[in-house]
Amino acid sequence: QAGPLPKPTLWAEPGSVISWGNSVTIWCQGTLEAREYRLDKEESPAPWDRQNPLEPKNKARFSIPSMTEDYAGRYRCYYRSPVGWSQPSDPLELVMTGAYSKPTLSALPSPLVTSGKSVTLLCQSRSPMDTFLLIKERAAHPLLHLRSEHGAQQHQAEFPMSPVTSVHGGTYRCFSSHGFSHYLLSHPSDPLELIVSGSLEDPRPSPTRSVSTAAGPEDQPLMPTGSVPHSGLRRHWE
């Protein structure tokens, strides 16, 4: 008796975070024996879509010509071979930006910071929101969440960084969101360039924050230190 069919691979091009109105293609890659591919969306009762495999039959394309709120969500795909259906793929979370107006990102006391000192990035929205995300360009794990507890709405979130090292330098943006759908984000804030200048004794990252030789600093999640700035906000890293 053969074991279960291997699960397919699911991904999105050009990526899984898509601006409103832009196109995105979801790909599901299975095996050469696939007869049919099925894409399921969380909380969608029927198979969300189904397609014939593209030659040589090992993958299928699911096109979204114009991104809207309805397409944002969590997807899985399957393929059917002559012996039955595969295991589900790992989930793909398709996020839409542009659902709300853009927040403002600023640095306190300044975006020019000396290594070893402290800086706080402040993300402010015009309307109250319950989730704020800080992303750093070219980081493999760019999302840092600050999510309010008990649905409390906030106009801003603070992301303290202390002590600052050269690793913290770079371009940041922030987003705001409502908790009822973390797949819907605001327009991105304008970029903020955080410039870290050296000190007489440039402190190295402490062992607890050191990066492995297998990955450079840009591959690490942002891990700012410090107490939670608002009593209503809880920190989440992804």
Partner: antibody
Amino acid sequence: QVQLVQSGAEVKKPGASVKVSCKASGYTFTSYWMHWVRQAPGQGLEWMGEINPSNGRTNYNEKFKSRVTLTVDKSTSTVYMELSSLRSEDTAVYYCARDRYDEGNAMDYWGQGTTVTVSS
Amino acid sequence: DIQMTQSPSSLSASVGDRVTITCRASQDITNYLNWYQQKPGKAPKLLIYYTSRLHSGVPSRFSGSGSGTEYTLTISSLQPDDFATYYCQQGDTLPRTFGQGTRLEIK
């Protein structure tokens, strides 16, 4: 019980368009894809396309892709099939049929059919 | 597209006869084969799905079998209500395609 009720017969001129409706009841409308199949007089069955009522996703037979449009109105549990640039060969009975998405990809319940006559 | 060919195109039989209709696919359809019955002026009705599974309410005198590219519908003992046209349909790939039909007439 599952019921698919289609709109009445239509007579159209060549070059015109026709829009046929199919109202579903007796089951959760958004949980099943819907097919459209046609049958010319004295001929066999020909699959035109399918639509997912929960999100409007469609798959079409290439033969009809440029002329057929399937749409859905969730508020009334109704799917529509519009066929444009009609010609005499489009004279047929048009059926909607519910998909039973499991092994077989069969069509388990059918509408009563809508006769479309294309004549100058 | 997958071509579906039924044989015979028409068939005369008597009440109580055992009847077999064959459907051949142009490629392997992995048992995704369904059978329908249609009477004049009426919509088709699903009889059998996935080669051999009886749709709800269908009498047990109807049965299906086959694999790969060859499939059969068998009516073990014809009843007066069974005289109709029968269609096979593949659900293996898009577009869905039907056989041309087999007309079953009273002898």
